[in-house]
């Protein structure tokens, strides 16, 4: 039951995280005009990964897309790439994890297959979350660098006669959404990996009872396991399924390896 809960929760957390990563990537407020210690402007500038916007005091908002690809800073391109990779991996991870969910039955899919799929999706979520966190962090670092550079040259002008105010940008809402979403996806991925351990076919479920037959040392295993000859020779007892799909209760009724003292 704990495995199902962990897997289900991991899936939900990752789903929320990926939705957040998509939202952050689409948001326009990656960087927003710094209003502190600046002249009070009648416009509010903010920028996203895909376009920059200006909101006038009347409420009128005008956005312009970055219609150039080659003219954009390499860092911005890198952030875009990281976010897109994160979304793609996350989306594939979600697709895989749906089929891996223990509560969903698809034909006679074996638990080992579900375990592998759970692990795969977990890893995908972890990488997706890391991509999002990395993308947001790179952008934040870029902002911090530019912020202090523009603070150093807050006013530039010809002989001090004409002043040009340099608009400073600070962290926008999308950065926080991205960090949180990336973190959630990462946590969801870890949960999926933990769930995978519980789903994976275990080692010997019951302590074998040795019956010493004439001249042979045979360890009899419970149904579903092949007998291993040579006491203690098979250190990694592999579970060999007898073809029949077990019910959920049957699977959960076996003690796990953690039950052994």
């Amino acid at each position: 039951m704990a495995v199902t809960a962990c897997q289900g929760l991991g899936f939900v957390v990752s789903l929320i995280g990926i939705a957040g990563i998509i939202a952050a990537t689409c948001m326009d407020q990656w960087s927003t005009q710094d209003l502190y210690n600046n002249p009070v402007t009648a416009v509010f500038n903010y920028q996203g990964l895909w376009r920059s916007c200006v909101r006038e005091s009347s409420g009128f908002t005008e956005c312009r897309g970055y219609f150039t690809l080659l003219g954009l800073p390499a860092m911005l391109q890198a952030v875009r790439a990281l976010m897109i990779v994160g979304i793609v991996l996350g989306a594939i991870g979600l697709l895989v994890s749906i089929f891996a969910l223990k509560c969903i039955r698809i034909g006679s899919m074996e638990d080992s297959a579900k375990a592998n799929m759970t692990l795969t999706s977990g890893i995908m979520f972890i990488v997706s979350g890391l991509c999002a966190i990395a993308g947001v962090s790179v952008f934040a670092n870029m902002l911090v660098t530019n912020f202090w550079m523009s603070t150093a040259n807050m006013y530039t002008g010809m002989g001090g006669m004409v002043q040009t105010v340099q608009t400073r940008y600070t962290f926008g809402a999308a950065l926080f959404v991205g960090w949180v979403a990336g973190g959630l996806t990462l946590i969801g991925g870890v949960m999926m990996c933990i769930a995978c351990r519980g789903l994976a076919p275990e080692e010997t479920n019951y302590k074998a009872v040795s019956y010493h037959a004439s001249g042979h040392s045979v360890a009899y295993k419970p149904g579903g396991f092949k007998a291993s000859t040579g006491f203690g020779s098979n250190t990694k007892n592999k579970k060999i399924y007898d073809g029949g799909a077990r019910t959920e209760d049957e699977v959960q009724s076996y003690p796990s390896k953690h039950d052994y003292v």
Epitope: Q33, P39, T41, A42, V43, N45, V54, S58, R64, V165
Partner: antibody
Framework: DVQLVESGGGLVQPGGSLRLSCAAS????????MHWVRQAPGKGLEWVAY????????YYVDKLKGRFTVSRDNAKNSLYLQMNSLRAEDTAVYYC?????????????WGQGTLVTVSS | DIVMTQSPPTLSLSPGERVTLSCKSS????????????LAWYQQKPGQAPKLLIY???TRESGIPDRFSGSGSGTDFTLTISSLQPEDFAVYFC?????????FGGGTKVEIK
């Protein structure tokens, strides 16, 4: 047709108070920011204050902060300017103007103005 | 505060003449976010309220004749009346629309010669 009508002006003694009103019609008042601008006799225009459609933010010219208060009642389609501790230099024609939408913050419609005279 | 300087203070001209009014701001009115200039021009006739002619430094307000045109960027702006009409004799003000307080220039009076 957009119409802005100011009222409440008149003669007031120095140190006195006055409340100007601006009645708006012909447009959705609650969707627009509004300005007060004044013009001393024979002088140029001086921007006084701005109030956004939702009453926040509000901006004032520094020298009038604390003495003048701008407010609005969207239900009544009205804009107000409360003027306290009036001085002789506050004598001017006071205009209310609409903050135009998609006109780069320009003031697209103006009222005819109301004259405020501060004199003893 | 942004200081708006208009020149000349007075212009004496005849109908049909071309008029060029100048406006300079102490700070750039070009917003980097959208590369637009936030400057407006107004016309005021005696006893009347000001009327918006040009916004965004160069965009004519609807209903304004095309003889009026605005140009310039950053700190230097110009209002041009291609052929002065009798109804154009008035005072013209420029206004900073980017920074609060939204300061006006001192005005240029265009009078009949």
């Amino acid at each position: 047709d957009v119409q802005l009508v100011e009222s409440g002006g008149g003669l007031v003694q120095p140190g006195g108070s006055l409340r100007l009103s601006c009645a708006a019609s012909g447009f959705t008042f609650s969707s627009f920011g509004m300005h007060w601008v004044r013009q001393a006799p024979g002088k140029g225009l001086e921007w006084v204050a701005y109030i956004s459609s939702g009453s926040s933010p509000i901006y004032y010219v520094d020298k009038l902060k604390g003495r003048f208060t701008v407010s609005r009642d969207n239900a009544k389609n009205s804009l107000y300017l409360q003027m306290n501790s009036l001085r002789a230099e506050d004598t001017a024609v006071y205009y209310c103007a609409r903050a135009g939408y998609a006109v780069r913050n320009a003031l697209d419609y103006w009222g005819q103005g109301t004259l405020v005279t501060v004199s003893s | 505060d942004i200081v708006m300087t208009q020149s000349p203070p007075t212009l004496s001209l005849s109908p049909g003449e071309r008029v060029t009014l100048s406006c300079k701001s102490s700070q750039s009115l070009l917003n980097v976010g959208n590369q637009k200039n936030y400057l407006a021009w107004y016309q005021q006739k005696p006893g009347q309220a000001p009327k918006l002619l040009i916004y965004g430094a160069s965009t004519r307000e609807s209903g304004i004749p095309d003889r009026f045109s605005g140009s310039g960027s950053g700190t230097d702006f110009t209002l041009t009346i291609s052929s002065l009409q009798p109804e154009d004799f008035a005072v013209y003000f420029c206004q900073n629309d980017l920074f609060y307080p939204l300061t006006f220039g001192g005005g240029t009076k265009v009078e009949i010669k």
